[in-house]
Amino acid sequence: IFKKEQAMCLEKIQRANELMGFNDSSPGCPGMWDNITCWKPAHVGEMVLVSCPELFRIFNPDQVWETETIGESDFGDSNSLDLSDMGVVSRNCTEDGWSEPFPHYFDACGFDEYESET
């Protein structure tokens, strides 16, 4: 199931790159699959929020992204995720790349990457 989510994540990243005009030399943070969930590409200064993944949920391929972005980009969905919600994880896109997730998955979602790799 996670191989399928990873493959769909890579497809979504590719579509997002096209929409946002990202390429390999673009400044910012590339989209990534971190073995738990999918992170969209982001510009430096953006905070990207994701909901804790449902472990056995298949990504909906019709949905371009399932995250909310705070920053200059308005690319996101209508979920209006907020760090004041439970079960929301954020990463900041910095000049040095992606920050660590906050909160850590284990604290925000109750599981970590070791479980989702099995």
């Epitope: 760090l83 439970m86 850590h104 604290d107 109750g110 599981f111 970590d112 070791y114 479980e115």
Partner: antibody, heavy 123, light 107 residues
């Protein structure tokens, strides 16, 4: 009914190792939904979470930075118990030590606790 | 580490009173907050998790509220067995940290 029973010495000399054990009944240390924690309480530091061990597809540990260089929490699956080892103790480590089970419902909380063990560090 | 503060540090009340204890976090913690009760010589006991959810077996006179940095524990119609010390605890970032406690004693 989950119960946690603590055992271990109440007096440890400075520079030595504090060792406590927490025996679990009504649950398993290998549970794939619980975490197994150690917390201590002293008048000077209040309640202080020290760390936890848990099993999912492998064993993992999380430790508080304040004790990370000195602490080890080990599960013992054959006896369904887990232990705390704190090395190089000083009188500041004198406290009541508790083991506790962590349960997840939107967040981690400690829903079952051991009876507590007063450990005094003194020569 | 996230610092947790509680007020008041102690309060005196009578059976039947309604009391409120406040807990404040040094940074936003959403609703990642638990409340515990501790009686002398005993281990802490979970009362409320995730700010307002009552733990199984806890009387409904206990209630919690709050989000972000400010939280409250309310006890309606204080009972003799409620005289104890109450602690809040954040569970958003390790190390999980506790407040210093609020001691509730008999007026």
């Amino acid at each position: 009914q989950v119960q946690l029973q603590q055992s271990g010495p109440g007096l440890v000399k400075p520079s030595q190792t504090l060792s406590l054990t927490c025996a679990i009944s009504g649950d398993s240390v290998s549970s794939n939904s619980a975490t197994w924690n150690w917390i201590r309480q002293s008048p000077s530091r209040g309640l202080e979470w020290l760390g936890r061990t848990y099993y999912r597809s492998k064993w993992s540990n999380h430790y508080a930075v304040s004790v990370k260089s000195r602490i080890t929490i080990n599960p013992d699956t054959s006896k369904s118990q887990f232990s705390l080892q704190l090395n190089s103790v000083t009188p500041e480590d004198t406290a009541v030590y508790y083991c506790a089970r962590g349960t997840w419902k939107q967040l981690w909380f400690l829903d079952h606790w051991g009876q507590g063990t007063l450990v005094t560090v003194s020569s | 580490d996230i610092q947790m503060t509680q007020s008041p540090s102690s309060l005196s009340a009578s059976v039947g009173d309604r009391i409120t204890i406040t807990c404040r976090a040094s940074q936003q913690i959403a609703r990642y907050l638990n409340w515990y009760q501790q009686k002398p010589g005993k281990a802490p006991k979970l009362l409320i998790y995730a700010s307002y959810n009552l733990q199984s077996g806890i009387p409904s006179r206990f209630s919690g509220s709050g989000s972000g940095t400010d939280f409250t524990l309310t006890i309606n119609s204080l009972q003799p067995e409620d005289f104890a010390t109450y602690f809040c605890q954040q569970a958003i970032i390790q190390p999980y940290t506790f407040g210093p406690g609020t001691k509730v004693d008999i007026k």
